[in-house]
Each structure stands twice: as structure tokens, then as C-alpha cells.
């Protein structure tokens, strides 16, 4: 069995379109190397949204490119995720790595169902 | 045991605040008219929202000042609550009463968790 | 594609030296721990070595222990073992595989021999 | 050099049922997870069942895993031509601090 990951079970994007969800981990060692992937589920599909390896020391870095941003302190990973729309509406799952030292570890948590809302159009100013 | 009540498990309000969904009832005889209560559960706690009594042949009125309309076709009644703010995110739960001709009959479905989120205020037009 | 290819493995004499390559490509190679692991012929596999994404920070067996250094160098997508000492019993084939174990090289063959 | 035990070689017959078993002690796969690695000839190992117990990406439903005290089970149903390899098992063991790996299994496809 693996590595017991928590995160919430409901989500509600802003009407920007962010979404923000604590991942956290139980970890029985200490992880000097963490990788954090956020995973789309739909049906038996899983894509990767984006994914970060951070040290426990330094700060959370995901790609320039990436729509995800994160903090971590911990075992606790302060995931958020922009530029979302109604169609993006759906399970996102937190996987954790414990990379380095060894022993490698893996956890996947049971997913965060995050609802966006399209924002009506705001009127044209004359 | 209660006559079986079917709705949604969840809904997503508009981003202007407006929440539809489907309460379905299950009915052995035919029912001339027929009470809908719409109640909102936070905690042990129930409130009414809103509530119509309608005759299968006419169309489901609610009051006036109700924040509710609805339309009804045979054992469905498609309810819409207007004005939602975020704070009035919760569990709405759908209450159906055959009022008559007898015998009476009252159901509850499990209820419709409903997530609102408030708009973005538009900037000013200069 | 995720491939790794293991280079450098030769014939070499007892107390000689080589240096293994791992050359990476498809992933992200700077975000990733590595690992390498051998297989001596008709043995099981041992693992020896690892070193975190950033190369900061290794860890290795006893038996290799002041003979052999990991390293990597990210900006060329590359993973290194450094083999000074060598002894008859490092005869193996040399893998090296991401640390989540989910991508291995084809391995490269040191033979150790007089 | 090899810490988890399991038997040299097995073998079945096409569509038939095979398990490879693999001990260890309370300080590894009593304590741990159990990963499991196909090797074909001539070629690296690649990743069977993940330490979580699950299968990798891409490997089929036929490939399952079992645990009870300090011995893992590899199960291959529906035996294919395909599926003829070596198989190594490997733990974390907690006293050694270190990766540890059976001697690996050599899968015969009976004609």
C-alpha cells in the first residue's frame, strides 16, 4: 500500500478561474527531495496538469509555463491552480514522490473535485 | 418509509447566482396536487427556502417575493433558486408532500449540495 | 520518449579506473534523483548508488565506499560513476534508472580482469 | 549480495498460471514495500509493479501481486510467448539501509 496522501474532497475555482488545495503527506523518514504531481482524472484517463521536485529547504518551483503554483512547508504542499474554465471542471489528484534519500515512496490522494463557473461577461463600457 | 425523492447530488449556481435542478418523485397513484418545499440544511438545522403547492394540470407557483420558480411535468419539478451569494453554499434538500386526494404521502430527497461563487465586480466604466 | 543509454564500460585491469556515462533524454533530467544499480554475471541486482536532482547531496554502499563517486551534470542531461580501485568483484553490468524506478538504461559491461 | 530469496527458474505452459515467489525478512519486506522489475534478455530491467503495489504504466492485468508476512508473490495468468524473462523482486531494508533484490527468476514458456 502506498504512502498515505490527504487532500480535500471539494473544491470551488474563483470566478478567475484559481483554484487553491492543501496536499499533504505522511511520510514515516525524512524527505530531503519531494515531487509533487497534479493529475486530471477523467474516466480511467489520468493527464499530468503539472508537476514540481522541491527540497525541503527551498521553495516549491513549478515550470515558467506551468498553471500550477505552490508553496510547501513540511510534509504540507499549498497547491494552486490558474487560468481554469468550466470545461476544466473535474477530479484532480495529488501524487507525492519521496525522491531522494532513499527508500522511494510513492502516494496518490483520492482527489479534489474542483468546480469552476465561467464568469458572465462584463458590459462593454461606452 | 417515505415515498422515494430523487435530485442531484450537486449543482453549480451561475455565475450570476441562479441554481436549477430536477426533483423527481416516485408515485403509486396519481396525485392532483402536490406540495414542493425546498429546504436549506446547515448542520441539524433546517430552513425553509421556498415552498408551492401545485395541481398536476396547472403550472407550480411560488410566491411573489419567493427567491424560487419552477415548472412541473408529471412526477418531475424543475426548481430554480435565484439571487445566490457564496455564502449561501450548502446542502438544499427537496421535499415533496401529496397532499391530495388521500392517502397523503411525504418524501426528502438526499439533497443538492449547491456551490456558488460570487462574481468579480466589473471595473468601473469612466 | 524516456531513454537513458549507459556509456564507458570496458575491459579494465585491477586498481584501473573508468568512468560510466548515463546520457538522459525525454524528461525532465534536472528534476529527477538518480540511481545506479549493477548486475554481476548470473547474480541478482544490487543497487550501489544515488544522488538527489540537484547533485548536492549521495549516497552509496560500503563495498564501494572511497572507490567510486556519483555525479551528474544537468546541463548536459548526464549521470556519472567515477570508478577508481577496481576490483575482480565489480564485474557487472552497470544501470543507471530514475529514483521512482520507473525508467532504466540498457546497462553498459565492466569487466575487471589481469 | 542477493538479500531477498526466490527460486531460480519456473516455468508453464502457454495460457497457464505461474508465481514467482520472494522472502525476505521482518526488516525488509515484513517492514516494506515490494517492487517487481521484467528483464528480457539482453536488455535493462523495466518496472512491473510500482512500490505502492501497483502495476506500471502499460503493464497488463495479468501481472498481480501479493503479500503475507515477509514473503511477496509475482502472479502471471494467461501465460504468454512474450512474458519469458528473468523476474527480480526487490524492498527497502530498514537495518541495512539500503535497496535489496532477490537473485532473480528465469520464466520458461513451455512449448
Known amino acids: 500500500k502506498g504512502m498515505h496522501v490527504a487532500q480535500p474532497a471539494v473544491v470551488l475555482a474563483s470566478s478567475r478561474g484559481v483554484a487553491s488545495f492543501v496536499c499533504e503527506y505522511g511520510s514515516s523518514g525524512n524527505a530531503a527531495e519531494v515531487r509533487v504531481t497534479v493529475l486530471r482524472q477523467a474516466g480511467s484517463q489520468m493527464t499530468e496538469v503539472c508537476a514540481a521536485t522541491y527540497t525541503v529547504e527551498d521553495e516549491l518551483a513549478f515550470l515558467d509555463d506551468s498553471t500550477c503554483t505552490g508553496t510547501s512547508s513540511g510534509n504540507k504542499v499549498n497547491l494552486t491552480i490558474q487560468g481554469l474554465r468550466a470545461m476544466d471542471t473535474g477530479l484532480y489528484i495529488c501524487k507525492v514522490e519521496l525522491m531522494y534519500p532513499p527508500p522511494y515512496y510513492v502516494g496518490m490522494g483520492n482527489g479534489t473535485q474542483i468546480y469552476v463557473i465561467d464568469p458572465e461577461p462584463c458590459p462593454d463600457s461606452d | 418509509k417515505g415515498m422515494h425523492v430523487a435530485q442531484p447530488a450537486v449543482v453549480l449556481a451561475s455565475s450570476r447566482g441562479v441554481a436549477s435542478f430536477v426533483c423527481e418523485y416516485g408515485s403509486s397513484g396519481n396525485a392532483a396536487e402536490v406540495r414542493v418545499t425546498v429546504l436549506r440544511q446547515a448542520g441539524s438545522q433546517m430552513t425553509e427556502v421556498c415552498a408551492a403547492t401545485y395541481t398536476v394540470e396547472d403550472e407550480l407557483a411560488f410566491l411573489d417575493d419567493s427567491t424560487c420558480t419552477g415548472t412541473s411535468s408529471g412526477n418531475k419539478v424543475n426548481l430554480t433558486i435565484q439571487g445566490l451569494r457564496a455564502m449561501d453554499t450548502g446542502l438544499y434538500i427537496c421535499k415533496v408532500e401529496l397532499m391530495y386526494p388521500p392517502p397523503y404521502y411525504v418524501g426528502m430527497g438526499n439533497g443538492t449540495q449547491i456551490y456558488v461563487i460570487d462574481p468579480e465586480p466589473c471595473p468601473d466604466s469612466d | 520518449e524516456v531513454q537513458l543509454v549507459e556509456s564507458g564500460g570496458d575491459l579494465v585491469k585491477p586498481a584501473g579506473s573508468l568512468r560510466l556515462s548515463c546520457v538522459a533524454s525525454g524528461f525532465s533530467f534536472s528534476s529527477y534523483a538518480m540511481n545506479w544499480v549493477r548486475q554481476a554475471p548470473g547474480k541478482g541486482l544490487q543497487w550501489i548508488a544515488g544522488?538527489?536532482?540537484?547533485?548536492?547531496?549521495?549516497s552509496h554502499i560500503d563495498a564501494i565506499k572511497g572507490r567510486f563517486t556519483i555525479s551528474r551534470d544537468n546541463a548536459k542531461n548526464t549521470l556519472y560513476l567515477q570508478m577508481n580501485s577496481l576490483r575482480a568483484e565489480d564485474t557487472a553490468v552497470y544501470y543507471c534508472a530514475i529514483s521512482n524506478w520507473a525508467y532504466w538504461g540498457q546497462g553498459t559491461l565492466v569487466t575487471v580482469s589481469s | 549480495q542477493a538479500v531477498l530469496n526466490q527460486p531460480a527458474s519456473v516455468s508453464g505452459s502457454l495460457g497457464q498460471r505461474v508465481t514467482i515467489s520472494c522472502t525476505g525478512s521482518s526488516s525488509d519486506i515484513g517492514k516494506s514495500y515490494v517492487a517487481w522489475y521484467q528483464q528480457l534478455p539482453g536488455t535493462g530491467p523495466r518496472t512491473l509493479i510500482n512500490?505502492?503495489?501497483n502495476r506500471a504504466s502499460g503493464v497488463p492485468d495479468r501481472f498481480s501481486v501479493s503479500r503475507s508476512g515477509n514473503t511477496a508473490t509475482l502472479t502471471i495468468s494467461g501465460l504468454q510467448a512474450e512474458d519469458e524473462a528473468d523476474y527480480h523482486c526487490s524492498s527497502w531494508d530498514w537495518s541495512l539501509h539500503t535497496y535489496v533484490f532477490g537473485s532473480g527468476t528465469q520464466l520458461t514458456i513451455l512449448g
Open positions: 512500490v505502492d503495489g
Open positions: 544522488i538527489n536532482s540537484g547533485g548536492s547531496s549521495t
